[in-house]
Every structure is written in C-alpha cells, then in structure tokens.
Interface confidence: medium
C-alpha cells in the first residue's frame, strides 16, 4: 500500500503567440480545480478505461477575476498536494492523467458551468520511494509543471511497496493462536529525518537532515514561495538560486527533444520547439488522441482533421461542450412560456401548461380565445384578457367540458315544468303561459304578450300547431348548427395538432443544436 | 374558503436543514399548483419554485437549485419546502401561495413562515 | 432572467386622490404582470392579473394598463385599506420575477 502524491506548480498560458489571456471566459470570474487519474501500464488504455489505480481531485482554487489590459499572470492555484492512495502493489508503470478544470462563477442558468481546460496525459516509470519527479506538459495553448512521486505507507516499503518490514520495536514471533506471520524485513527502512522545521508541503529530503524545495518554493524551510518573475515565470528564465532545479551545462547537448522538436538554448535551461501535435518540455508527449478518452458521458471519439485538434468528441443528447463534459439542463432554458412546467424525458422534452395555454411551449393563449378554450360546441367569449365559454344546452363548467342538467337552472318560467331532451329540454307551461321558456303570459282578453305574433293568436287556435312547428324547426336548426359547428372544429384541431407536433419537433432540434 | 397555514417561525443552526410545511384547505389540493416565494428582512419577493401536487412536478428558479427541494403529502393536502446547508443568507420570510387555474400565478398566499438561522 | 423595474419605491398620498405605479420589463413580458398588495397582519392580496384582469372581489378603483414592457397600476380615489406596500410581477415565464416594491402611505 502507499500513496501517489502529485504537487501542480503552476498552470499558464504556453509561450508563443496566441496564447489565451485568461481561463475565464468572457462571462466572468472563474477558479481552476485538477483531476489526476492513475492507470496501471504503459499500453495505450481504452478510451473509456477506470482509472483503475486511483484518481483524486483536488479543492477549488481561489477565484480569478481577469484584470483588463495587466498580463496574464500565473492563475491562483488550489492549495496541497493532490494524493490518490493505492492499496496494493505500485506497478512501476502508469499512465498519470492530469485535467485542469475552469468552474465558471457568472450569471450561469443552473449554477456553476464546469468546463476542461487542458488534459495532459504522461506515461511514465516510476519506483516508489524514490524523489520528486519534476515535469512541464503543455496542452494546446495552456502550460502546466508538477512533481509527483510514489510512497510506501509502512510496513510497506520498497520499489512497489510489496515487501514489508518490522518495526523495530516490534517482536520477533507472533503470539500464540494467530497465523504465522507475513515474511518481514528485519527492519523498517526508516524515512530520513528532514531538517526540523522543513515543510511537509512544500519540502523534501533524501538524507537525513536536509530540506530540499518542490519547484516554486525556497528559502531554508522551503516556506517561502518563490516570485512569479524568477523560476515560475511562464516565459522568464529557471534560475537556481530560488530553489529551482534546472538542467545542467549544454542543455542543448544530445538534443533533448523528441519527435523532431528543436532545441534553443535560454539562459540556464533550453527550450522546445515541438512539431505539430507534441508537445511537453521535451515535446515527448503527442497531443490528447482518442487513446486518451478524452470523451465523458459517452461521447463518440473521432480523430479531428484539423492537425492541431487531435480529436473531436460527438455528445450524446444531453451533454455538450469539447469533451460532452456539461450535462445540458436542458429545462433549465425555460422553454416553456406562461408557466407551464418543463419535463426532461431524455430523448424529448415536453411542457405541461397551465390552463389557458396550450402548445408545445403553452405559447398559445386560449383565453384570447384563439385555441381551442371552449368544448363541446361552446362559444368563447372574451373580456379583460380572461375568457368566458358560453356553453351549448347541455354542458357547462370553465370549458364547457361538464355535462349539465338542461332543468337544474330552473329555466321554464312562471311555474312551468321542465323535461331533459337529447338537444336540450323542453318547458310545458302552466295555463295561461306560452313560448319557449313560459315567459309570455297569455292576456284576459285572449291576446298574448308575445311580440311580434299575428294578432288574435290563442292558444286554443288551430294555429298554435304552426307555432309548435316553428319552434321545432328551429331547434332542428340548431342541433344542425351544432353539429356543424363541432366537425369545423375537429377539423382546426386536427391542423393545430400537426402544427403543434411541427413545433415541437423543431423545438427539440433547436434545443440538441 | 381556501386557506394556506404555515407555521409562524423557525430557528436553525447554520449548516442544517428545516423541512417548512403548508397545509391547504378548502379547495381541491390536486388542482392547483403550488408557489414558494422567498423575502428577506426590509427586501423584495423572490421566487423559489412551484410544485404539481398531482405528480410532484416541479419548476426551480436556477438561484435555489440544490438549496429548496419541493415535495407535497397528497394524504394530508401539504406541500413542504426543504432548505439545506442552511446559511444566514437563507434567513427570510418563506411564502406558499397557491397557483390559480386561469392565468393569474398566484391567488391565495399563506401567512409566511419566518426562517432565522443562527448558531 | 427578466428584470422587472418597479417605480417609484415611495409615495406618499392622501384619502380621496389618485396614484400610479409603474413597472418595466426588461423584455416583453405581453400581457403577463400582476399586481399585489401586502399589507401587515394579512395575506398578500392578488389585485391584477394579466396586465389589465380584476381579481374577482377587487374594488374597481384598481385598474391594470400597459402590455409588452410598460405597465401601471392606478388607484383612484384612495380609501384608508389601500395605503399598504404593491409589488408588481411577471407571470410569462419562469422564474418569475417580482419587482422591488412601492410603499405607499398616508400624507
């Protein structure tokens, strides 16, 4: 068992021109936080692979706020070492998988945006217990440096922490009853003693008594972080009186840069120039492919035609961004209007609206009467931005959508008796009452109130019959009316419907663009 | 009549969580959705989200994501408000109010409920 | 989000005059603002709905105007019960958004 410690130094725009002035974006104020994932062995690893030794991740850093027109300047960093603890044997070789990531602190439509900045991806050979390994990768435009190392965590020790070791206060033999005890070492290989006071943050030893400084910090304790304008500088000169370890004389001697790379001396250190598609202090690193599963969430890996972009990812639906890191929220767009409630179904999304909205996005106002409000034959009336069915005989409620008793109003006048009928009810009145509704009264000296009737009309007159007939026309008149009236509007449902499956078909793509 | 009963206060330790209620009554609870409406000391109305209480549907301002989590009890005609990791920023007057059925958002309002969070 | 920019914040009347308060979207909000009365003791109170819509049992001495981003609130002939705080809102899209309030008191 032990621990993979890794240590970010700095993290910054590369050199050269085009290089980014701010992690942020234009939205505002963000702060950077690392991921490290360990796979085991140097073979190219499944896209998709776990990071089957460990990973970790580190705190946020704090926040950076762009200054305009100051140059950009190293990025405030998290604090501490980022540890990914193994439990069984160091396999000597992995594959160290860095990601920057930018956690974007605007105005953003569901909280914080998160977002990779740069994944770096070293495969190395590393003993455990052996020193700080210092490193300078560089991913597109960005450029990172960090030390990193393996630990035994005693009574594990050794170059894979699989040989273990008694303490030396411990006993020879194990008790009585218990199984015999795993082969030990006759001694714990005790670490050496740093020089009192030297930080365990920041500082190392390999012999007793010494107090050697990760990269970017000095002074005898190691406490003291070194200035942005020596060694951390993103393009100044290493200088190793700050407690930098740079390499030695002719550092241009044997050229130290793979895959073609040229090599420039700068004051005390040398710099590469990579070819398209590698880069890191030595351009030994070629640029993110498919082989490192750049890809979250299921993303489709395609290798990019663009030589300076290695890959493309393709998202599901539901995720966006260059790696399909960002889980759209798609409801989070509010694409539903007047308040209708929004359902993420995955491969659809769909508004539940509020009464008095319909559509896809309930854009549609049915209180302006201009959708289907009113079932049933009802009429819509409108009035102050509300509306109002006049419901056909029979029906009643908001919508015209509940069946009413034609006879529960009390309709027939003047204690005349209601009966129900299929297109509405029918009133027969007491004597000395007649029309539609009994409203009319019959007068003493026979003639009736009725306006508008031919003069002498009785109700005992053989033309009563006509009147009869008349009205039974009219009701004929109606219900055909009705009828009518309720095929128009299937009919303009029909068309609304597929105008509203149009809509929203157009509404998922534009919400998957 | 329609009625909406919240309780009148609530005192929390920072860092905890406080589960409010509003019990309706009066109307049909099913049928009309429910609001949360947040207002902070001397400030304005914010607000926080509605619920369906047919299926427990509900619409989030993005500002309480991951702070408000709105539930109902069908059984008991309430819906509840859970605040979380609980700060003094979260020390308001929280609201129910009930969604009319037309196009009017919010027509009847619950006394409010007054969250103070101090350790 | 839309921003709804209640004004004034203040103002000070007598029984009797007439009053307006305005809100203003920051985008087109069509019909959809309502007003609402707070007043201490009581439940805030739905006046307006849909820009212009009375509240069914609000007095008709409160009326809505205004669509798209300008609207206001007018109260005429003032009764003793009206001096009490309003906030107008949007109900057109979510969040819904209120606006910062106006205190209205007696002269």
């Known amino acids: 068992a032990g621990v993979f410690e890794l240590q970010i130094h700095s993290f910054g725009p590369g050199p050269g021109p085009g290089a980014p002035r701010s992690p942020c974006s234009a939205r505002g104020p963000c702060r950077l936080f690392f991921r490290v994932c360990l796979k085991p062995g140097l073979s190219e690893e499944a896209a998709e692979s776990p990071c089957a030794l460990g990973a970790a991740l580190s705190a946020r850093g704090p926040v950076y706020t762009e200054q305009p027109e100051a140059p950009a300047p190293d990025l405030p960093l998290p604090n501490g070492l980022l540890q990914v603890p193994f439990r069984d044997a160091w396999p000597g070789t992995f594959s160290l998988i860095i990601e920057t990531w930018r956690e974007e602190l605007g105005d953003q439509i569901g909280g914080p945006a998160w977002s990779l900045l740069a994944r770096v991806t070293r495969r190395r050979r590393l003993a455990a217990g052996g020193p700080w390994a210092r490193d300078i990768q560089r991913a597109g435009a960005w450029e990172l440096r960090f030390s990193y190392r393996a630990r035994c965590e005693l009574p594990a020790v050794g170059t894979a922490c699989t040989r273990l070791c008694r303490p030396r206060s411990a006993p020879s033999r194990c008790g009585p009853g218990l199984r015999p005890c795993a082969p030990l070492e006759d001694e714990c290989e005790a670490p050496p003693v740093c020089r009192a006071g030297c930080s365990l943050e920041h500082g190392f030893c390999e012999q007793p008594g010494e107090c050697r400084c990760l990269e970017g910090w000095t002074g005898p304790l190691c406490m003291v972080p070194v200035s942005t304008s020596s060694c951390l500088g993103l393009r100044g000169p290493s200088s190793t009186t700050t407690g930098c370890l740079v390499p030695g004389p002719g550092p241009c001697d044997g050229n130290p840069c793979a895959n073609g790379g040229s090599c420039s001396e700068t004051p005390g250190s040398f710099e590469c120039t990579c070819p398209r598609g590698f880069y890191g202090l030595r351009c030994e690193v070629s640029g993110v492919t498919c082989a490192d599963g750049p890809c979250f969430n299921g993303g489709l890996c395609v290798g990019g035609a663009d030589p300076d972009s290695a890959y493309i990812c393709h998202c599901p639906p539901g995720f966006q961004g260059s790696n399909c890191e960002k889980r759209v929220d798609r409801c989070s767009l509010q694409p539903c209007r007047n308040g209708g409630l929004c359902l993420d179904l995955g491969h659809a999304l769909r508004c539940r609206c509020r009464a008095g909205f319909a559509g896809p996005r309930c854009e549609h106002d049915l209180d302006d009467c201009a959708g289907r409000a009113c079932a049933n034959g009802g009429t819509c009336v409108e009035g102050g931005g509300a509306h109002r069915c006049s419901c056909a005989l029979g029906f009643g409620g908001r919508n015209c959508r509940e069946r009413a008793d034609p006879c529960a109003a009390r309709p027939c006048a003047h204690g005349g008796r209601c009966y129900a009928h299929f297109s509405g009810l029918v009133c027969a009145c007491a004597p000395g009452y007649m029309g539609a509704r009994c409203e009319f009264p019959v007068h003493p000296d026979g003639v009736s109130a009725l306006p508008a009737a031919p003069p002498g009309l009785r109700p005992g007159d053989p033309q009563r019959a006509g009147v009869i007939a008349v009205i039974v026309v009219v009701v004929i008149a109606i219900v055909a009316g009705i009828v009518v009236l309720v095929i128009s509007r299937k009919k303009r449902m029909a068309k609304y419907e597929k105008a509203e499956i149009k809509e929203m078909g157009e509404m998922h793509r534009e919400l998957n663009a | 009549q329609v009625q909406l009963q919240q309780p009148g206060a609530e005192l929390v330790r920072p860092g905890t969580s406080v589960k409010l209620s509003c019990k309706a009554s009066g109307y049909t609870f099913t049928s009309y959705w429910m609001h949360w409406v947040k207002q902070r000391p001397g400030q304005g109305l914010e607000w926080i989200g509605v619920i369906d209480p047919s299926d427990s549907l509900a619409n989030y301002n993005q500002e309480f994501k991951g702070k408000a989590t709105l539930t109902v009890d069908t059984s008991s005609s309430t819906a509840y408000m859970q605040l979380s990791s609980l700060t003094s920023e979260d020390s308001a007057v929280y609201y129910c109010a009930r969604d009319s059925t037309v196009v009017a958002p919010m027509d009847y309002w619950g006394q409010g409920t007054s969250v103070t969070v101090s350790s | 989000d839309v921003q709804i920019t209640q004004s004034p914040s203040y103002l000070a009347a007598s029984p009797g005059e007439t009053i307006t308060i305005n809100c203003r979207a920051s985008t087109s909000i069509s019909k959809y603002l309502a007003w609402y009365q707070e007043r201490p003791g009581k439940t805030n109170k739905l006046l307006i709905y849909?820009?212009?819509t009375l509240q069914s049992g609000i007095p008709s001495r409160f009326r809505g105007s205004g669509s798209g981003t300008d609207f206001t609130l007018t109260i005429s002939s003032l009764e003793p019960e009206d001096f009490a705080m309003y906030y107008c809102q949007q109900h057109h899209v979510y969040p819904y958004t209120f606006g910062g309030g106006t205190k209205l008191e007696i002269k």
């Open positions: 849909s820009g212009s």
